[in-house]
Interface confidence: low
């Protein structure tokens, strides 16, 4: 799917209404300096594709990601958003509900959600080049300034 | 520098096709996306579609699908427009033009010099 | 498709005057940009995301809105804002409006 079109603000608004909350609620007793971001994104289109695969494609030592609540938000805001995102997503969710659906929150997984988080933040601050300035615009966890 | 460098004018037939380049330099140019934007003498701007050089994935002006085609050469930088079955209400200038998403909104901010294309039997 | 309409068509003024160009969009749209046209020229990006001027574009110049309804306003008119102004929307894709066209009166 490519998400050129999708209403970037109002994915914006359900990420830092709700799915970011659910982001640190799954992440808690995490230090937020444990894992390091290795996955960016250059672009908000290209940020969603990777927010996508993180969440939805099961991988080596997380396989129950996208049956968690940040997850789930993820996915309705995307089919709400992004013209004809649900029509791609029906072999996936066919595909999803095969897989397991004990919640183990392993190691791997809670690094997966970090890297989520780093690829959310960038989505959410795309730099704004006015009069010179190349200043993130700070509209979630003021603390962050990474500059990519 | 940014620079967004068209090809020259075309005179066509009715009934023929048209295929205009954009060569672009100055930016990595996968990571952005480039638009067409035409532009009948006189008239307000008309945009034709938008493609991510990153993955290839297009969307179109519905008014247009079925004829254009927008395509890129990512080793040589270039995005192209080809447009199909001109009329003579497809003269005008046609503009390819860069967008730059680190702008909230995705906006236009570089653009061609413009290709001028007449159809004319 | 979302439409945008532009009003007035052209505005006749002189220099020093105010100038207040209007866009309407058939349905909500998040941000507006508005780009700069003069004859022969491509259309040069003038007012991004509704309020944020482009590099180089003199403070006269102010955007505002929300929803339906932008605004682009140019306090005192100078000889080189004689151009024509275009809005521009992307919520839905991409639609320009049909221009406002700032004459010397």
């Known amino acids: 799917y490519d998400f050129t079109n999708c209403d970037f603000e109002k994915i914006k608004a359900a990420y830092l209404s709700t799915i970011s909350k659910d982001l640190i609620t799954y992440m808690s007793g995490t230090k937020s300096t444990e894992f390091n971001n290795t996955v960016s994104c250059s672009n908000r289109p290209h940020c969603l594709t990777e927010i996508q695969s993180l969440t939805f494609n099961p991988t080596a030592g997380c396989a129950s990601l996208a049956k968690e609540m940040f997850a789930m938000k993820t996915k309705a805001a995307l089919a709400i958003w992004c013209p004809g995102y649900s029509e791609t997503q029906i072999n996936a969710t066919q595909a999803m509900k095969k897989a397991r659906k004990s919640k183990v929150t392993t190691n791997k997984c809670l690094e997966q959600v970090s890297q989520l988080q780093g690829l959310w933040r960038r989505f959410n601050r795309p730099l704004l080049k006015q009069q010179g300035s190349s200043d993130y615009k700070d509209d979630d966890d003021k603390h962050h300034h990474h500059h990519h | 520098e940014v620079q967004l460098v068209q090809s020259g004018a075309e005179v066509k037939k009715p009934g023929a096709s048209v295929k205009v380049s954009c060569k672009a330099s100055?930016?990595?140019?996968?990571?952005?996306?480039m638009n067409w934007v035409r532009q009948a003498p006189g008239q307000r701007l008309e945009w034709m579609g938008i493609i991510s050089p990153y993955n290839g994935g297009t969307s179109y002006n519905q008014k247009f699908k079925g004829r254009v085609t927008l395509t890129v050469d990512k080793s040589a930088s270039t995005a192209y427009m080809e447009l199909s079955s001109l009329r003579s209400e497809d003269t005008a200038v046609y503009y390819c033009?860069?967008?730059?998403?680190?702008?909230?909104?995705?906006?236009?901010?570089?653009w061609g010099q413009g290709t001028t294309v007449t159809v004319s039997s | 498709e979302i439409v945008l309409t532009q009003s007035p068509a052209t505005l006749s003024l002189s220099p020093g005057e105010r100038a207040t160009l209007s866009c309407r969009a058939s349905s909500s749209v998040s941000y507006m940009h508005w780009y700069q046209q003069k004859p022969g020229q491509a259309p040069r990006p003038w007012i991004y995301a509704t309020s944020n001027l482009a590099s180089g574009v003199p403070a006269r110049f102010s955007g505002s809105g929300s929803g339906t309804s932008y605004t682009l306003t140019i306090s005192r008119l100078e000889p080189e804002d004689f151009a024509v102004y275009y809005c521009q929307q992307w919520s839905s894709n991409r639609t320009f409006g049909g221009g406002t066209k700032v004459e010397i009166k």
């Open positions: 100055g930016y990595t140019f996968t990571d952005d996306y």
């Open positions: 033009a860069r967008e730059d998403y680190d702008y909230d909104g995705y906006a236009m901010d570089h």
